[in-house]
């Protein structure tokens, strides 16, 4: 997985994909995609979209293309998690979800993908030139990270191509194991996605999916994202930065896993199952840059496969470690 890759080799479905293709054409590509993915090295994709309804609002979607079980997902902004990034959300498949301002809603979309809505105004608000990174910790493959951002002049509501575009490599054994039929299928999938890319946005249809019910298809676009496709171009202020000590909440709290309502720890049971309830409101924990650890004379704490997050009353920090904040 390259954090620098720009080649749009394979992209997650774009908003409006369902409208662009019928149900029949949706099924085959995803079956094929699943097969294509199993042959390669784990990859992470990131998609960033600016919502036109609120110009300071972003939706970040990330997914893991791999066969291992996901232990933890960490979303950060301002750079990768070990290189100056500030943690926005940590999602554990069993212990639940934790988020920090300006994150508004983080949730599991499927067992291997998540979404995060960001909003805000002032110093902590996201902007078009912000880099967002997602790191997936998976057993036994390890930790995989990718980053993406919107170009400064992006049309509101339209998503930037996922960056880095996952490039699915396969070793010789993987290649030999894939039949000609599967190879054709992968090519066909790419053809469908590319063909969709050049289609006009579909006519809007009201979403029939209640947010409280599991969705029939993981990629069904929300009403908000559908509406966003038809809002005129607007420019946004790009002078923003991640919140640091002077803009974040100054006080910590007890270990948040212990206080999570049970619904927040809902684990999706199937590939298309969605976390069915809104997660707790953003916490009042300090979200700081890595450098502050050095001042305290301590190494940035890591969290990992099992996670006991934030027992430290000072709260979580953006850590050098991959799996989350301790």
């Amino acid at each position: 997985m390259r954090t620098e890759a720009q080649v749009p080799a394979l992209q997650p479905p774009e908003p409006g994909l369902e409208g662009a293709m019928g149900h029949r054409t949706l099924v085959l590509p995803w079956v094929l995609l699943t097969l294509c993915v199993t042959a390669g090295t784990p990859e992470v994709w990131v998609q960033v979209r600016m919502e036109a309804t609120e110009l300071s609002s972003f939706t970040i979607r990330c997914g893991f293309l791999g066969s291992g079980s996901i232990s933890l997902v960490t979303v950060s902004w301002g750079g990768p998690n070990g290189a100056g990034g500030t943690t926005l959300a940590v999602l554990h498949p069993e212990r639940g979800i934790r988020q920090w301002a300006p994150a508004r809603q983080a949730r599991w979309e499927t067992q291997s993908s998540i979404s995060l809505i960001l909003e805000g105004s002032g110093a902590s608000s996201p902007c078009a030139n912000t880099t967002f990174c997602c790191k997936f910790a998976s057993f036994p493959e390890g930790s995989w990270e990718a980053c993406g951002s919107l170009p400064p002049s992006s049309d509101p509501g339209l998503s930037a191509p996922p960056t880095p575009a996952p490039i699915l490599r396969a070793d010789l054994a993987g290649i030999l194991g894939v039949s000609g039929v599967l190879l054709f299928g992968c090519v066909y999938l790419l053809h469908l996605l590319r063909r969709h890319k050049h289609r006009p946005a579909p006519r809007l249809q009201p979403s029939r999916t209640s947010p409280q019910a599991p969705r029939a298809r993981a990629w069904a676009p929300s009403q908000a994202s559908q509406a966003a496709l038809h809002v005129p171009y607007a420019t946004i202020n790009t002078s923003c930065r991640p919140a640091t000590l002077d803009t974040a909440h100054p006080h910590g709290g007890p270990s948040w896993w212990a206080s999570l309502p049970t619904h927040a720890a809902h684990r999706p049971q199937g590939p298309a199952a969605w976390a069915s309830t809104p997660i707790p409101a953003r916490g009042s924990f300090v979200s700081v840059e890595n450098g502050l650890y050095a001042q305290a004379g301590e190494r940035p704490p890591h969290t990992g496969p099992g996670l006991t997050l934030f027992p430290d009353p000072r709260g979580p920090r953006a850590m050098e470690g991959p799996l989350g904040v301790r």
Partner: antibody, heavy 120, light 107 residues
Framework: EVQLQQSGPVLVKPGASVKMSCKAS????????MHWVKQSHGKSLEWIGI????????SYNQKFKDKATLTVDKSSSTAYMELNSLTSEDSAVYYC?????????????WGQGTSVTVSS | DIQMTQTTSSLSASLGDRVTISCRAS??????LNWYLQKPDGTIKLLIY???RLHSGVPSRFSGSGSGTDYSLTISNLEQEDIATYFC?????????FGGGTKLEII
Amino acid sequence: EVQLQQSGPVLVKPGASVKMSCKASGYIFTDYYMHWVKQSHGKSLEWIGIINPYNGDTSYNQKFKDKATLTVDKSSSTAYMELNSLTSEDSAVYYCARDSSNVGNAMDYWGQGTSVTVSS
Amino acid sequence: DIQMTQTTSSLSASLGDRVTISCRASQDISNYLNWYLQKPDGTIKLLIYYSSRLHSGVPSRFSGSGSGTDYSLTISNLEQEDIATYFCQQGYTLPRTFGGGTKLEII
């Protein structure tokens, strides 16, 4: 301070088994995967396998699949590796190493090693 | 399995020198390359992870670079305590594999 304290050197006879330990301290044991690595005398390092202390899941290098068994005891924050049907080829220093759980998939802290000598 | 090759098995240098140790992977490992040092007493420490990120507590005279299949570790100002054997390791696929090591000695 993160520390991995391994059990002492052992001398065993061919055909026997040995179980070595790696006691972790200074961090939450179940939050990091644990690797085991072999270093034969004067040679390079060979990855044996990895265990997730949170749930006991394991993954092995095919070469060591029938040789090593990885386990953990969460209550004592200790990882174990058992080697069976020992031969002279198994004489080596064995290290436990914590997974950094960071991109790069490095091993950020290592035990001091357990020396195993197989001799009749 | 991915093979990791450190072509130089031993290297002699003087204190204060700039030393570069190289490592090559048998396939693209996308920066999933880590560097370790092993002291004569057997102690192993992580120096660099993900090709170029410095591990906590490691002196800034150590740096890593590279991409694709070719990577290098540079010690900008060699000190006595740097005398050790250096190993590279790929974290891109399982099984994890290591280079053969480069033993650094003082002239």
